[in-house]
Interface confidence: low
């Protein structure tokens, strides 16, 4: 017992002797923040000059303040021992480490690329300003069905599966919001399959008319090659989106 | 949607480049592109970031620069390159744009 | 390095409660940049807030963020059976390396 304090006495003495000798020998670690070491003062604590920062004690050098110009906006000042932090001007958004970069917003239902702002392709949406414009889900993974249809800035709403809308079916979830006394779960479901469906064929044929006068046989071939793509994005390419038919880019877009 | 590939069973010491391809998008438009990894029952751990579409540095942990290489590799790819391999490095790799995209994740052991 | 200290694991609550997790970081975390992950065994994590109180797209508005400089935290209210799940902050940083760190990661048990 008596030695292990003793070893513990001991240690704490080297430590603290340590301490004092690499003092002794460094007189630059004595330096607090927001000075550096001056070498040519004889290792004398200067303050760092204006426009430079340090934030660590013992430097022999302050670092260069970082300067908000342009689409940087000052967020918080340089100080003697914390660099200048940056943000955005409205309509720009941080990129980075540090707000490295500034990026331009987007509208909802667009991402930015090279060229600019452009919109989501078809069967896919961004809800933000910025980032990437992402597929919609795909409800059948799920064994669901389509509720509501997606759009550039929304994606899907995924409703119960087909076979939940069949009559006597035992569990139907509709993610509708509240129900209204008095009314099963099966004749909502049922209503909003009825309704849906018809929408979707009104949809469709009005589409492949406006695709018959306005763009002739080579689009009217893919609408009945691909039955099941929701034809009413199909006008798209009129608004400026960057978007392609399969046949003629893998992955439906041009970024 | 993004989809990493590369994992496999390699020895100490060997290299390996995993690769990030996104689908649906294209990083030819500025994404951060980071790198996390978890080894088997362990939390994650960053790797490393990198700016697509653009010539901005990219950003390290401090224990991964020079053994690990984050670089875009086409429109649609980012990789990791990773050399001197140890034990130490045996985990699921994902792939993830700006935190809020990841791919499920690609498995790489190191073990001889 | 940075250092993010999260609440211990495991952390339990009933159906229909509440979990609150800690996440304290070694340094002041750049501009808010905090993010807090949800993962389940075998799948990629999932962001569920980032800029420490901002809402990801699609999750539920039982997650709330909030906090600022070096302590932040994730509240779970209404808990529901498929929140069982480990959550971990993710911080960032005005630095060109270790930009990034992650919590260790904090289990939430729901019974």
């Known amino acids: 017992m008596g030695n292990s304090c003793y070893n513990i006495v001991a240690t704490l003495l080297l430590v603290l002797n340590f301490e004092r000798t690499r003092s002794l020998q460094d007189p630059c670690s004595n330096c607090p923040a927001g000075t550096f070491c001056d070498n040519n003062r004889n290792q004398i604590c200067s303050p760092c000059p204006p426009n430079s920062f340090s934030s660590a004690g013992g430097q022999r050098t302050c670092d260069i303040c970082r300067q908000c110009k342009g689409v940087f906006r000052t967020r918080k000042e340089c100080s003697s021992t914390s660099n200048a932090e940056c943000d955005c001007t409205p309509g720009f958004h941080c990129l980075g480490a540090g707000c490295s970069m500034c990026e331009q917003d987007c509208k909802q239902g667009q991402e930015l690329t090279k060229k600019g702002c452009k919109d989501c392709c078809f069967g896919t949406f961004n809800d933000q300003k910025r980032g990437i414009c992402r597929p919609w889900t795909n409800c059948s993974l799920d064994g669901k069905s389509v509720l509501v249809n997606g759009t550039k800035e929304r994606d899907v709403v995924c409703g119960p599966s087909p076979a939940d809308l069949s009559p006597g079916a035992s569990s139907v979830t509709p993610p509708a919001p509240a129900r209204e006394p008095g009314h099963s779960p099966q004749i909502i479901s049922f209503f909003l399959a009825l309704t849906s469906t018809a929408l979707l064929f009104l949809l469709f044929f009005l589409t492949l008319r406006f695709s018959v006068v306005k763009r002739g046989r080579k689009k009217l071939l893919y609408i009945f090659k691909q039955p099941f793509m929701r034809p009413v994005q199909t006008t798209q390419e009129e608004d400026g989106c960057s978007c392609r038919f399969p046949e003629e880019e893998e992955g439906g877009c041009e970024l | 949607s993004l989809e990493e590939s590369g994992g496999d069973l390699v020895k100490p010491g060997a290299s390996l480049t995993l690769t990030c391809t996104a689908s649906?998008?294209?990083?030819?438009?500025?994404?951060?592109m980071c790198w996390v990894r978890q080894a088997p029952g362990e939390g994650l751990e960053w790797i490393a970031c990198?700016?697509?579409?653009?010539?901005?540095?990219p950003h390290y942990a401090s224990w991964a620069k020079g053994r690990f290489t984050i670089s875009q590799t086409s429109s649609t790819t980012v990789t990791l390159q990773m050399t001197s391999l140890t034990a130490a490095d045996t985990a699921t790799y994902f792939c993830?744009?700006?935190?809020?995209?990841w791919g499920p994740g690609t498995l790489v052991t190191v073990s001889s | 390095a940075q250092v993010l200290t999260q609440t211990a694991s495991p952390v339990s609550a009933a159906v229909g409660g509440t979990v609150t997790i800690n996440c304290q970081s070694s340094?002041?975390?750049?501009?808010?940049?905090l993010s807090w992950y949800q993962q389940k065994p075998g799948q990629p994590p999932k962001r569920l807030i980032y800029?420490?109180?901002t809402l990801a797209s699609g999750v539920p508005s039982r997650f709330k963020g909030s906090g600022s400089g070096t302590q932040f935290t994730l509240t779970i209210s209404d808990l529901e059976c498929d929140d069982a799940a480990t959550y971990y902050c993710?911080?960032?940083?005005?630095?060109?390396?270790?930009?990034?760190?992650f919590g260790r990661g904090t289990e939430v048990e729901v019974k």
């Open positions: 993830s744009s700006e935190g809020n995209l």
């Open positions: 649906g998008f294209s990083f030819s438009s500025r994404h951060y």
């Open positions: 990198i700016y697509t579409g653009s010539s901005g540095t």
């Open positions: 340094q002041s975390v750049y501009s808010n940049w």
């Open positions: 800029s420490a109180s």
């Open positions: 993710a911080g960032g940083y005005n630095t060109v390396t270790d930009t990034f760190a």
